[in-house]
């Protein structure tokens, strides 16, 4: 039953003398395993003996053994899935048809594929995208319908007979759809490769040449042009005649229109390949080309520089840069239209003419005001010499010069009064717009420059003002020399460094920061009596009674300044020391007396001693001795010590009298 | 097989002349540009000058510039590069080479030819 | 002229490791018309790279081109023992045409 053979092989195998064939085959035989395999050349079936005749190239028996005459001849495969053969080497007469006796325990087939046996190497076949532009990539490919493994083979591209620089693609198929190689050369053809051959050579393992194919390329571009001029160097002077002429070097498909363009632009009405230009002007200068079209776009010539000379025309001044801020650098160029270029020029500045400056620009590294103004040039070439233009301006542009700031107001000026100054300058480019003060206070300026200080402070030394227009200049600062009484006074103890103490020699010095006029007078006051009139108040010994507050008084022509209160401490030992007695220095028995101990001392006592009439110390250290009751025993003398930090002091001694009471006299 | 064939090399004095050779075979010699290459003995590589397929335009070194011609004969499929003046740094390895755009890599060299200039 | 200036002068590496070869130019090449070519000692140099990165017919795929502008560098993946030779690189964007100084690649 034929419907149970499945095969699949290419259907004709291509090889040549001495080559090989690799036949990749499969199939399938549904009742079971390959029992036994013959293959045969050119096949016929014998209806006599029901068998098939022919050469037999390879037979497999059941034992699986090969017979060593069929080596050349391989059966790859195996007894279920796989047919594939190997013939190595293939010969001519080895073309026709093969058939596979395939036998299955019930089944048989034969199955027949074609072998081409070529005498020598065929060709290659080359295929070329239909069409090919300049500078477009294209694949060019070239197909062998011939693969074996146990030969091998490289296809090689060549260009006019050099191998082709661009790395080529090499693929093999050896599968049950198709055997071939094919070799993939990517290249992007330019117009020069146009009508070039292109070869795809068959070589052997060892590059030894087998066959080719060639083509010739069809590269479609632009059409290619030259231009010619005469003159050749294309310069000519006014008046005279030009002949320009395009050749096409190259051009596929042929070209359709001519044109010629100048600086870009279409010339009309010119529309063959000579360009005749008769008594040029100078407008005719220009860069020339001719284009020619095919279908597959416009192609231009290199371009012509076509130089009509002519003596230069009006001069024209360009600065760089005008405004020019004084200091900068400043280039003038001289513009002439002219061919050839001027070789000498000429600068005027106001009218005259500038010495030494012969050049097409003139550099001036360190730009002044009086450089300021119009500048003008004439420029000469080898056909004359040309007329002095307009001119062009330089404004030269610097900060405010020579600022001052000046006092309006009569001198001298005093604290608080309302002082008025003005900034002024002596020349400006462009004008002042406004103008800043230094130090900045709450003045006002009442109009533009002038700045009014209401109520001076004594401190107002110096103001400076600027003068600005884009930029500022500062004038020197001026001295506001404002006058006012002397300030912060006081009074200073230079002597003793330490406290003060009676007998001691003082010196107290009146001292203030400032006073503007400077000579000044000094008064010393004590309790409203004047004292002296000295910057120092001197002491030889201080007393007591030196103690109290002190005020010193300074003034100069504008007005006079009192310190405040000083108080003068002097310290002492207690002094006019008595003891006083309560109720009276003769008190009855039985009743209260108390003794004080009375004095005078800086500081005040801090310790106090008393003393009876036999100079014997009592214990008792308050400032008040009390006795109660006191006894008659108690009549006697007292005295009382007192100290202080500075010393000691007594006094002289105060007798208590007690007398009995009429109780004890009705006693007795 | 693609082939490039240097001769006309040898000794020469300074100020003398030399004419080099470079014979092609195996491609369509009139399709290609040709250059002439040299290497100093230890040196890179330098470029001397080149010649269009058609022959028409002509590159030369400044180094060799009105000292040096470069020309070709279709015909006979050869280059050549006529040597006048010549310098003891002239001393090199001359290489030609082919190559299909005047401007280019170049894709296959001669084996080379020795020029000595001395005294 | 565009002056071509390769480095390092010499490369010391092992046989198996990456090169990295560099050659930078004066001013950019137009197109990126740029060559490298390989010189075996007594023998005339062999295109290897042109446009830069485009590898030449028959050339391994171990050598690889890269760069544009001014800076470009040949990179071979692992060296052979064959590879340990000169290196040249060449502009064509400009005539005068030009060579680098070259790179000699050496078995460390």
């Known amino acids: 039953d034929s419907s149970k053979w499945v095969f699949e092989h290419p259907e004709t195998l291509y090889a040549w003398e001495g080559a090989c064939v690799w036949i990749p085959c499969t199939y399938r035989a549904l009742d079971g395993d390959l029992e036994s395999f013959i293959l045969f050349h050119n096949p016929e079936y014998n209806k006599n003996t029901s068998k098939f005749d022919g050469t037999r190239l390879y037979e497999s028996t059941k034992d699986g053994k090969v017979p060593s005459e069929q080596k050349r001849v391989q059966f790859l495969g195996d007894k279920n899935k796989n047919c594939t053969l190997s013939i190595h080497p293939v010969h001519l007469n080895d073309s026709g048809q093969l058939g596979l006796r395939m036998e299955s325990k019930t089944e048989k087939w034969m199955e027949r594929i074609h072998l081409n046996v070529s005498e020598r190497p065929f060709p290659p076949h080359i295929q070329l995208p239909p069409e090919i532009q300049e500078s477009q990539e294209v694949t060019l490919t070239c197909l062998l319908n011939f693969s074996c493994y146990g030969y091998p083979i490289q296809l090689q591209w060549l260009l006019e007979g050099v191998p082709m620089r661009q790395a080529a693609v090499t693929s093999t198929s050896l599968t049950i759809k198709s055997v071939f190689t094919r070799s993939e050369l990517k290249f992007s053809p330019q117009w020069s490769h146009h009508g070039k051959i292109v070869t795809c050579q068959l070589q052997d393992a060892d590059g030894k040449f087998l066959s080719n194919d060639t083509v010739q390329l069809n590269v479609k571009h632009t059409p290619k042009l030259e231009i010619k001029v005469t003159p050749s160097d294309a310069i000519v002077r006014e008046g005279d005649s030009v002949t320009m002429t395009c050749e096409v070097s190259s051009s596929n498909p042929e070209y359709t229109t001519v044109s010629w363009l100048k600086d870009g632009t279409s010339l009309k009405k010119q529309n063959t390949f000579t360009l005749n230009l008769r008594e040029v002007t100078k407008d005719q200068s220009g860069k020339y080309c001719c284009q020619v079209s095919n279908d597959v776009g416009p192609g231009r010539s290199e371009e012509v520089f076509l130089q009509v000379q002519y003596a230069p025309e009006p001069s024209t001044v360009q600065i760089l840069h005008s405004p020019a801020v004084e200091g900068s650098q400043v280039e003038f160029l001289c513009m002439s239209l002219a061919n050839p270029l001027p070789t000498n020029y000429t600068w005027y500045h106001n009218g005259k003419e500038m010495q030494g400056r012969t050049e097409e620009k003139v550099h001036i590294p360190k730009i002044l005001p009086w450089h300021a103004g119009t500048y003008s040039c004439v420029a000469e070439n080898i056909l004359g010499t040309g007329q002095r233009g307009p001119g062009a301006e330089l404004d030269v542009q610097y900060p405010p010069k020579k600022v001052t700031t000046v006092i309006q107001n009569p001198m001298p000026i005093r604290e608080g009064d309302t002082v008025t100054l003005s900034c002024n300058y002596n020349s400006s480019n462009p004008s002042v717009t406004r103008y800043e003060w230094k130090p900045h206070g709450a003045w006002e300026e009442p109009s533009l420059g002038v700045l009014k200080i209401q109520n001076v402070g004594w401190d107002n030394t110096t103001i400076a003002c600027a003068a600005c227009n884009s930029w500022c200049s500062w004038a020197s600062p001026v001295a506001l020399n404002v006058q006012y009484a002397p300030r912060d006074v006081r009074v200073r103890k230079i002597k003793p460094l330490s406290e003060i103490h009676s007998g001691n020699s003082v010196s107290l010095q009146c001292d203030f920061s400032s006073s503007h006029p400077k000579e000044v007078q000094f008064f010393w006051e004590k309790n409203g009596r004047l004292l002296g009139k000295e910057s120092q108040l001197n002491f030889d010994s201080i007393s007591p009674e030196d103690a109290g507050s002190y005020s010193c008084w300074v003034n100069n022509s504008i007005g006079q300044t009192a310190s405040k209160a000083w108080t003068l401490e002097v310290l002492y030992a207690p002094r006019r020391l008595r003891v006083s007695m309560s109720p009276g220095d003769q008190v009855m028995e039985g009743k209260s007396a108390t003794l004080t101990c009375e004095s005078d001392a800086n500081p005040p006592v801090s310790h106090y001693t008393w003393f009876d009439w036999n100079n014997q110390s009592l214990p008792y250290h308050s400032q008040k001795l009390r006795l109660e009751p006191v006894k008659v025993q108690h009549s006697g003398a007292y005295w009382c010590q007192g100290t202080n930090s500075v010393g000691k002091g007594r006094s002289p001694l105060s007798t208590l009298t007690v007398y009995y009471s009429p109780e004890t006299i009705g006693r007795r | 097989e693609v082939q490039l064939l240097e001769s006309g090399g040898g000794l020469v004095q300074p100020g003398g002349s030399l004419r080099l050779s470079c014979a092609a075979s195996?491609?369509?010699?009139?399709?290609?540009?040709m250059t002439w290459v040299r290497q100093a003995p230890g040196k890179g590589l330098e470029w001397v000058s080149t010649?269009?397929?058609?022959?028409?335009?002509?590159y030369s070194a400044d180094s060799v510039k009105g000292r040096f011609t470069i020309s070709r004969d279709n015909s006979k499929n050869t280059l050549y590069l006529q040597m006048n003046s010549l310098r003891a740094e002239d001393t090199a390895v001359y290489y030609c080479?082919?190559?299909?755009?005047?401007?280019?890599?170049?894709?296959?060299w001669g084996q080379g030819t020795m020029v000595t200039v001395s005294s | 002229e565009i002056v071509l200036t390769q480095s390092p002068g010499t490369l010391s590496l092992s046989p198996g490791e990456r090169a990295t070869l560099s050659c930078r130019a004066s001013q950019s090449i137009s197109y990126n018309y740029l060559a490298w070519y390989q010189q075996k000692p007594g023998q005339a140099p062999r295109l290897l790279i042109y446009?830069?990165?485009s590898r030449a017919s028959g050339i391994s795929d171990r050598f690889s081109g890269s760069g544009s502008g001014t800076d470009f560098t040949l990179t071979i993946s692992r060296l052979e023992p064959e590879d340990f030779v000169v290196y040249y690189c060449?502009?064509?964007?400009?005539?005068?045409?030009?060579f680098g100084g070259g790179t000699k690649v050496e078995v460390k």
């Open positions: 446009g830069a990165s």
């Open positions: 195996g491609f369509t010699f009139s399709s290609y540009a």
């Open positions: 080479a082919l190559h299909w755009e005047l401007l280019d890599a170049f894709d296959i």
């Open positions: 060449q502009q064509y964007g400009s005539s005068p045409l030009t």
């Open positions: 010649i269009s397929g058609s022959g028409v335009s002509t």
